[in-house]
């Protein structure tokens, strides 16, 4: 039986190569895809009790979360 996509890379293996511009890292299958294929959680209203994810740098420097949306930089990918 095919293993799940999350099982293809061992926890101790090197982190994937950072995505090129206009691509974002899909956390669920662990590879780079066009940013528009992914969806981040809805933006929080001002004053929400839980902090929003930190804003990412350029997509090639971080894990993107979709064009024009906040994303979460993942140090292991930098």
């Amino acid at each position: 039986m095919r293993r799940g996509p999350r099982s293809l890379r061992g926890r101790d293996a090197p982190a994937p190569t950072p995505c090129v511009p206009a691509e974002c890292f899909d956390l669920l299958v662990r590879h780079c895809v066009a940013c528009g294929l992914l969806r981040t959680p809805r933006p929080k209203p001002a004053g929400a009790s839980s902090p929003a994810p930190r804003t990412a740098l350029q997509p090639q420097e971080s894990v993107g979360a979709g064009a024009g949306e906040a994303a979460l930089p993942l140090p292991g990918l930098l």
């Epitope: 799940g4 956390l27 669920l28 895809v33 528009g36 992914l38 894990v63 292991g76």
Partner: antibody
Framework: EVQLVESGGGLVQPGGSLRLSCAAS????????WNWVRQAPGKGLEWVGY???????YYNPSLKSRFTISRDTSKNTFYLQMNSLRAEDTAVYYC???????????WGQGTLVTVSS | DIQMTQSPSSLSASVGDRVTITCRAS??????????MHWYQQKPGKAPKLLIY???DLESGVPSRFSGSGSGTDFTLTISSLQPEDFATYYC?????????FGQGTKVEIK
């Protein structure tokens, strides 16, 4: 806002087949992750599987041999084909859309599947 | 598969009480510095509702009395002051590894 509407549930005999549909509006099923989750009467939630933006599917291994998820992008609808149904497959079946982290933030209303002779 | 164990399975509480539900994973659900742990509320006859994602992020529209914490294998959902509409069943879920799995649920009942 994503809206999901399931259909296709009903009574089926053991060994029979059924196809559930989940019609999505508010976002394209070619974006993100689209799940099926089921809940047997009085029991907890069980993830069935997903189909993602590229059409890649992944299933709960306990169900994979009998259940298949597919999609029709022209209808913005995805499906759960269930074969060789058993009494223990009796459940409410929900479709749900996952966010960037896999959390399911939009759910359908559920459709009841009853497997009984 | 990652097994999710919630405790308690049920609890009785009064309006205004502080309620804590725990969820333990059989292995870490953290990766890339993220906890792939989420919490849902479900009322009878209704679909589940996402409360908390990524262990501690409050879903839009969810009251601030709900909070989540934890990392690795141990996680907590806290309701700071229980309200009448909070009597329901709560589930944790991990999406760190396929197959995604849920806890068995914690039913919060009126004392």
């Amino acid at each position: 806002e994503v809206q999901l509407v399931e259909s296709g549930g009903g009574l089926v005999q053991p060994g029979g087949s059924l196809r559930l549909s989940c019609a999505a509006s508010g976002d394209s099923i070619t974006r993100g992750y689209w799940n099926w989750v089921r809940q047997a009467p009085g029991k907890g939630l069980e993830w069935v599987g997903y189909i993602n933006y590229s059409g890649t599917t992944y299933y709960n291994p306990s169900l994979k041999s009998r259940f298949t998820i597919s999609r029709d992008t022209s209808k913005n609808t995805f499906y759960l084909q269930m074969n060789s149904l058993r009494a223990e497959d009796t459940a409410v079946y929900y479709c749900a859309n996952s966010n960037f982290y896999g959390a399911m933030d939009y759910w359908g209303q559920g459709t009841l599947v009853t497997v009984s002779s | 598969d990652i097994q999710m164990t919630q405790s308690p399975s049920s609890l009785s509480a009064s309006v205004g009480d502080r309620v804590t539900i725990t969820c333990r994973a059989s292995e870490s659900v953290d990766d890339y510095g993220i906890s792939f742990m989420h919490w849902y509320q479900q009322k009878p006859g209704k679909a589940p509702k996402l409360l908390i994602y990524r262990a501690s992020d409050l879903e839009s529209g969810v009251p601030s009395r709900f909070s989540g914490s934890g990392s690795g294998t141990d996680f907590t959902l806290t309701i700071s002051s229980l309200q009448p509409e909070d009597f329901a069943t709560y589930y944790c879920q991990q999406t760190s590894k396929d197959p995604w799995t849920f806890g068995q649920g914690t039913k919060v009942e009126i004392k």
